[in-house]
Each structure stands twice: as structure tokens, then as C-alpha cells.
């Protein structure tokens, strides 16, 4: 059986995983999920709109995508945040703007950041902003696996499908 | 063989590679095009560079990529902005910059936003800037459908193959 | 079986999973490496810790990823930058930083760029700052080619496995 | 083969519980996730939830959360479905199920009857 | 929770008619659409998932469409073995929840 006799820093690094086995070899199991624009203060995400889509197995489960079936994926996410000028009036404070997504497993009592992204913002005078954050990696998951993000300064997000976005594929 | 009968500059561009034999369902459309250096003020595509190439149907139209077969793609592009301080005779304003991956479709009469970066840059007095944007994401796409980009500061590119380019391949 | 006799914080790391049987013909060479955060002044890439991972050929030589076969690769890399306000008594001086995946390949006797970002920071008085870059693109590699990463900037890395990490997947 | 044989179920007394196992085989057991779905007599088909053996992962209907216990053990290859506080209501075949994709039910057991009854 | 509606709840039909059984969902829910063949005291069988795909070993007479909240299952020829009772299921969110079924049963 894979790993049986491996000493555990083998195991560490051999990390062997379940490769789909898959009746239809050809079943691709992609998402590709966008913000939804009519929810201004939280980020919710949804894949039956505009271009998103969920193939081949992905679900969605409390705002989290559920991995179908054991593997390497590769997973992305971007966010574009804008903010105006503060007023001359009010004390301009740095904003950390920051964007993650993150690994719920029952293995782990707590969510595993598997990618992330931070910014500091120092808004001034008459001086709009806006910032982009993308990020994508390979990731050895497993058959129903919790794929979620985390993002501070969502009242800042530009809530459109071309902007903040979220999705994973097989490999 | 691979390079065969190239000159040293045509092999060292075109990196013909061995591919391993495969079946005609392995077809593996992929593109990966870099900004022409010798157009400043253009942000034109090419695939004859370098290392760009287009692979099993992609090609080139009117400076777009057209899907050469139905499926979902990872679509993904690059730009890199830089630009001198103002000179303090000159007033600064803001810089807006932007890249945008659009798609224009035989079912819609408008091209459509797939992926878009933005940022405000405020350039200041002996402060040279840089600024890199990067997006990419997984699409239902249509053969014949066209793949394109839109920039704003263009004459700001820092056009070079490791910095500026626009690729697709099929999942 | 997989994962038994493993302390949960081995099993945490190792996710030891078990392989189905494959035929050749499936197999998909992927890596993701992560910047090992015990090394503070330099950028050295590790794939036996956390969710980092060599398969189906994949190797590291000298910090460097080792194609395992000739093909098209979608190849990717991310670094997070932060740095603390510049103290009243120093000297403010911009910082240039700057994150590129090169190539080494028997072909060039040097190292060709294939993804490059930059940015220009600005230290102020009381403002910490933190920038993230990211890049990602499809190449034609070579048996035997190898990709590496040159950064400037290292003192200043975010060094966590969400953070900063480098990795690659056969098309 | 994929075979999947539920077992334990019968007369539960309202307010009782039940533990129902499923034993598997013809397959890596820590590859797959398994279901539990249940049907009321004459009725459709609920999803109760599912656990991965591998890591012991599980998702449940919020309708069955707190109600529900689903496990497995890996050295036995078989999976459980414990239910507490049982009503009336409660009474159905439950089946355990193996996904292709996550969400696919592709194999079924042959499902186990629970009545729950004074 | 997504709702799924399925009609008609029963249907009669002889040997080589053409069936359309249909779906509704109570909001749009992509192409995540399964359904599932179910005879009397067995456990049920997939038989198409992702709204058109037809499952491993499932004749071809099945076949089923739709998106986004209508969805159809139609069998071109009923054989003798397709009398039974048919379930969709949406696969887009969970819960991951079931139409009340449609019985066909023999004219």
C-alpha cells in the first residue's frame, strides 16, 4: 500500500495523493465563480451568472467550493479594491487590504491559508485609489475538501465579474 | 529533428520542441504571445518571438487570439508599467492604469470583460514608479471566439517577453 | 495504510493519500515549492514542508526546478514584500524590488527571463508597507531545463507558505 | 466490484438513537468520500451527509447537523451514521452511497430500514 | 435550500413512446442537474449527471437538457426496464436536494 514502510519524513516529502479515477477520463472538473455585485458589504460567491460555471462535479457549500474528487488543482482568485480621497476634515488611517484563500479540512480545526495576498493603503487629499490582488497555485486536495476565501477591506471591493473572481481546475 | 535546418536565431526563437507522440484527442491547444518591443506607443501581439508560440489551432487575428475548438481555457495576461518623476515645472496627475482580457463573441455585439486589473498612480517629484498587473482565469469558450486586450497607459509598458504577455491554453 | 503512525502534525504535513493505478500516459508532472521561512536573507525553495510537493518526475537542483519531460508547462511564481516605516534620523531611500522566473537551458549559456514583475517603494515616516507580487505563464520546456528564481528585495520577503511560493504543471 | 452493504437498522423507540455501519469494498476506501441518504416510506430522497474516510472530513444538512454523527474507520473499511434523538419522522431506508464526483451518487448499498416507533 | 419540482408526479406510457419528464428549480442552478432511475425496493441508479451527460453503461435512449432552472429527462423509446420512478437531484449547492420523483408506470 502507498506510504506503508515510509519513514515519516518520506511520507512528508512523497505527499502521495489519490489521482482521479474516473470512469469518463475525460471529465475536467473546473469552477469558475464571481463576486455578487448586489451584495456591497460581504463577499458572496455565485456560478450561475454571467461567465461562471461550476463543471464536472464542483459544488458550492456555504460560500466555499467543495473539491470533487482527489488530486492536483490549480486554484486562483483575484479582488480589485478602490476607495476615494478622504476629506480634509477626517484623519486619514492606513487601510490593510488583504486576500486570502484557505483550506477547511476536518483534518485541521481551523482553516489553512493556501494562498495569500496584503497591501497597505495610505488614502490622502483629492487622491483616489484602486489595487489589484491575483493569485493562483497548485494544490494536492482532497474529494470534499473546503476551498473558501477571506478578504479584509470588502467594503472596497469593485464587485465585477471581471474583477473579483475565484476558481480552481483539475489537473 | 527539432532546430534542424533553423537558422541559430530562428532555432533559439522558435524553440521547436519534441513533442511526445500523441493521439489526436491529446491535442493541446495552447498560446502564449508577448508585447512587440518595437511598438511603443501599441501594444501589439506576437508569436514568432522569442519564447511565444501558438499551438494545436490558435492563431492570430486583427491582434486577438481566436479559440480554435469549444471548451474551457485558462486564459491569462501580463503588463508591466514604469514611468519617470514629473518635472517639478510640470503639474502631476494621476495616472490612471488599467489591463483588461476581453472576449468578443458572435453572440454578444460587444466585447466582453473577462479579466481586469487597475490601478491609480500618483507620480512624484524625483520618484521613478513601476507597477506590475497580472490576472488569469478558467472560461467557457467558444471555437472562433476572439481574445483580446485593452490597456490603458500603453506608452507606459515596459514592453519586454518577461513582462508583457497574453496567453490561453485549453484544460 | 496511509497516514497511520504519523503524529497529527506529521499527518498534518505529510496528507499522505493513496496513488491509484495509472497508466503511463496520465502521468502529469507538477511541483509547488514554498520559500523556506528558517532563512531569512535568502530565497531557498523547499518541497518537503507544509502543502508543497514534487510529482511525476519533478526534481530540485541547486534551488532550481528540473523539467522531467519536454512539453508545454504553465509555470508560476508569487512573493509578498513588507517592510516598516524608515526612522526619522534615516534616510528615506526608494526600494526597488523585483521578482523574476528565469530559465537555464543548455540551448543559452545564460539565463533568459520568463516572468518578471517590479515595483518601486517609497518608505515613509510611520507607514508600514506591503506588496505582493504575482506571475504565472505557459512555456515550451525542455527535458532537463532548469527554472530558478532571482529576486530583489529578500530582506524584505513575507516568507509563509501562502506568501511566497514558486511552482510549475505540464499542459 | 464497488459493494456497499448497510446494516443495523430496525425499531428505534422515539427519543432513542441508532448507529448504522456500511462496509465497503472493491475499492481504496480512503479514495472516496461516502453518503448517507435517506428515503421515507412512499417518499423522496434526502442527503444527509457525507465523511471522507481519508481525513475524516465531513459535510452534513444543516436540517441533520447536531442530530448526526458520521464517521468512519479506516482499518475496518466501513463508515457509520449515528442519529440521536429519533422521531417518528425519522423512520426511512437509509442508504449509504459512493460519489464518482463529489456530488454524483454512482454506487448505492442495498439500504437498511429504521423505524422509529413506540 | 434549493426546492426541485418535478412534473408530472406520475405518468402512463406504453412500450416505445417517447417520455419527457421535467425539473424546475427554485433558483438557477447552472447545468448541476443529476437524475436517477429508481425501481421498487431497490436503491436508486444514476443515470445522467451535469444536466446531459449520460453515466457509464446507461443506454443511449436516456438523455436529459436544460439550464440554469428548467431541466428535462427524456427517454426516445420506453423499454419494458424503464418503467420505474425517476429522481432529478441539483448538484450546484448544498444541501444537495431532490425532486419528489415521477412514477412511470405501464399503460
Known amino acids: 500500500l502507498p506510504g506503508v514502510g515510509l519513514t515519516p519524513s518520506a511520507a512528508q516529502t512523497a505527499r502521495q495523493h489519490p489521482k482521479m479515477h474516473l470512469a469518463h477520463s475525460t471529465l475536467k472538473p473546473a469552477a469558475h465563480l464571481i463576486g455578487d455585485p448586489s451584495k456591497q458589504n460581504s463577499l458572496l460567491w455565485r456560478a450561475n451568472t454571467d461567465r461562471a460555471f461550476l463543471q464536472d462535479g464542483f459544488s458550492l457549500s456555504n460560500n466555499s467550493l467543495l473539491v470533487p474528487t482527489s488530486g492536483i488543482y490549480f486554484v486562483y482568485s483575484q479582488v480589485v479594491f478602490s476607495g476615494k480621497a478622504y476629506s480634509p476634515k477626517a484623519t486619514s488611517s492606513p487601510l490593510y487590504l488583504a486576500h486570502e484563500v484557505q483550506l477547511f479540512s476536518s483534518q485541521y480545526p481551523f482553516h489553512v491559508p493556501l494562498l495569500s495576498s496584503q497591501k497597505m493603503v495610505y488614502p490622502g487629499l483629492q487622491e483616489p485609489w484602486l489595487h489589484s490582488m491575483y493569485h493562483g497555485a497548485a494544490f494536492q486536495l482532497t474529494q470534499g475538501d473546503q476551498l473558501s476565501t477571506h478578504t479584509d477591506g470588502i467594503p472596497h471591493l469593485v464587485l465585477s465579474p471581471s474583477t473579483v473572481f475565484f476558481g480552481a481546475f483539475a489537473l | 529533428l527539432p532546430g534542424v535546418g533553423l537558422t541559430p536565431s530562428a532555432a533559439q526563437t522558435a524553440r521547436q520542441h519534441p513533442k511526445m507522440h500523441l493521439a489526436h484527442s491529446t491535442l493541446k491547444p495552447a498560446a502564449h504571445l508577448i508585447g512587440d518591443p518595437s511598438k511603443q506607443n501599441s501594444l501589439l501581439w506576437r508569436a514568432n518571438t522569442d519564447r511565444a508560440f501558438l499551438q494545436d489551432g490558435f492563431s492570430l487575428s486583427n491582434n486577438s487570439l481566436l479559440v480554435p475548438t469549444s471548451g474551457i481555457y485558462f486564459v491569462y495576461s501580463q503588463v508591466v508599467f514604469s514611468g519617470k518623476a514629473y518635472s517639478p515645472k510640470a503639474t502631476s496627475s494621476p495616472l490612471y492604469l488599467a489591463h483588461e482580457v476581453q472576449l468578443f463573441s458572435s453572440q454578444y455585439p460587444f466585447h466582453v470583460p473577462l479579466l481586469s486589473s487597475q490601478k491609480m498612480v500618483y507620480p512624484g517629484l524625483q520618484e521613478p514608479w513601476l507597477h506590475s498587473m497580472y490576472h488569469g482565469a478558467a472560461f467557457q469558450l467558444t471555437q472562433g471566439d476572439q481574445l483580446s486586450t485593452h490597456t490603458d497607459g500603453i506608452p507606459h509598458l515596459v514592453l519586454s517577453p518577461s513582462t508583457v504577455f497574453f496567453g490561453a491554453f485549453a484544460l | 495504510l496511509p497516514g497511520v503512525g504519523l503524529t497529527p502534525s506529521a499527518a498534518q504535513t505529510a496528507r499522505q493519500h493513496p496513488k491509484m493505478h495509472l497508466a503511463h500516459s496520465t502521468l502529469k508532472p507538477a511541483a509547488h515549492l514554498i520559500g523556506d521561512p528558517s532563512k531569512q536573507n535568502s530565497l531557498l525553495w523547499r518541497a518537503n514542508t507544509d502543502r508543497a510537493f514534487l510529482q511525476d518526475g519533478f526534481s530540485l537542483s541547486n534551488n532550481s526546478l528540473l523539467v522531467p519531460t519536454s512539453g508545454i508547462y504553465f509555470v508560476y511564481s508569487q512573493v509578498v514584500f513588507s517592510g516598516k516605516a524608515y526612522s526619522p534620523k534615516a534616510t528615506s531611500s526608494p526600494l526597488y524590488l523585483a521578482h523574476e522566473v528565469q530559465l537555464f537551458s543548455s540551448q543559452y549559456p545564460f539565463h533568459v527571463p520568463l516572468l518578471s514583475s517590479q515595483k518601486m517603494v517609497y518608505p515613509g515616516l510611520q507607514e508600514p508597507w506591503l506588496h505582493s507580487m504575482y506571475h504565472g505563464a505557459a512555456f515550451q520546456l525542455t527535458q532537463g531545463d532548469q527554472l530558478s528564481t532571482h529576486t530583489d528585495g529578500i530582506p524584505h520577503l513575507v516568507l509563509s507558505p501562502s506568501t511566497v511560493f514558486f511552482g510549475a504543471f505540464a499542459l | 466490484e464497488v459493494q456497499l452493504v448497510e446494516s443495523g437498522g430496525g425499531l428505534v423507540q422515539p427519543g432513542g438513537s441508532l448507529r448504522l455501519s456500511c462496509a465497503a469494498s472493491g475499492y481504496t476506501f480512503t479514495s472516496y468520500v461516502i453518503h448517507w441518504v435517506r428515503q421515507a416510506p412512499g417518499k423522496g430522497l434526502e442527503w444527509v451527509g457525507y465523511?471522507?474516510?481519508?481525513?475524516?472530513?465531513?459535510n452534513y444538512n444543516e436540517k441533520f447537523k447536531g442530530r448526526a454523527t458520521i464517521s468512519s474507520d479506516k482499518s475496518k473499511n466501513t463508515a457509520y451514521l449515528q442519529m440521536n434523538s429519533l422521531r417518528a419522522e425519522d423512520t426511512a431506508v437509509y442508504y449509504c452511497?459512493?460519489?464518482?464526483?463529489?456530488?454524483?451518487?454512482?454506487?448505492w448499498g442495498q439500504g437498511t430500514l429504521v423505524t422509529v416507533s413506540s | 435550500d434549493i426546492q426541485m419540482t418535478q412534473s408530472p408526479s406520475s405518468l402512463s406510457a406504453s412500450v416505445g413512446d417517447r417520455v419527457t419528464i421535467t425539473c424546475r428549480a427554485s433558483q438557477a442552478v447552472s447545468s448541476a442537474v443529476a437524475w436517477y432511475q429508481q425501481k421498487p425496493g431497490k436503491a436508486p441508479k444514476l443515470q445522467i449527471y451535469s444536466a446531459s451527460h449520460r453515466y457509464t453503461g446507461v443506454p443511449s435512449r436516456f438523455s436529459g437538457s436544460g439550464s440554469g432552472t428548467d431541466f428535462t429527462l427524456t427517454i426516445s423509446s420506453l423499454q419494458p426496464e424503464d418503467f420505474a420512478t425517476y429522481y432529478c437531484?441539483?448538484?450546484?449547492?448544498?444541501?444537495?436536494?431532490f425532486g419528489q420523483g415521477t412514477k412511470v408506470e405501464i399503460k
Open positions: 465523511n471522507n474516510p481519508y481525513n475524516d472530513g465531513t
Open positions: 437531484q441539483q448538484h450546484y449547492s448544498t444541501p444537495w436536494t
Open positions: 452511497s459512493r460519489p464518482t464526483m463529489l456530488p454524483w451518487f454512482a454506487y
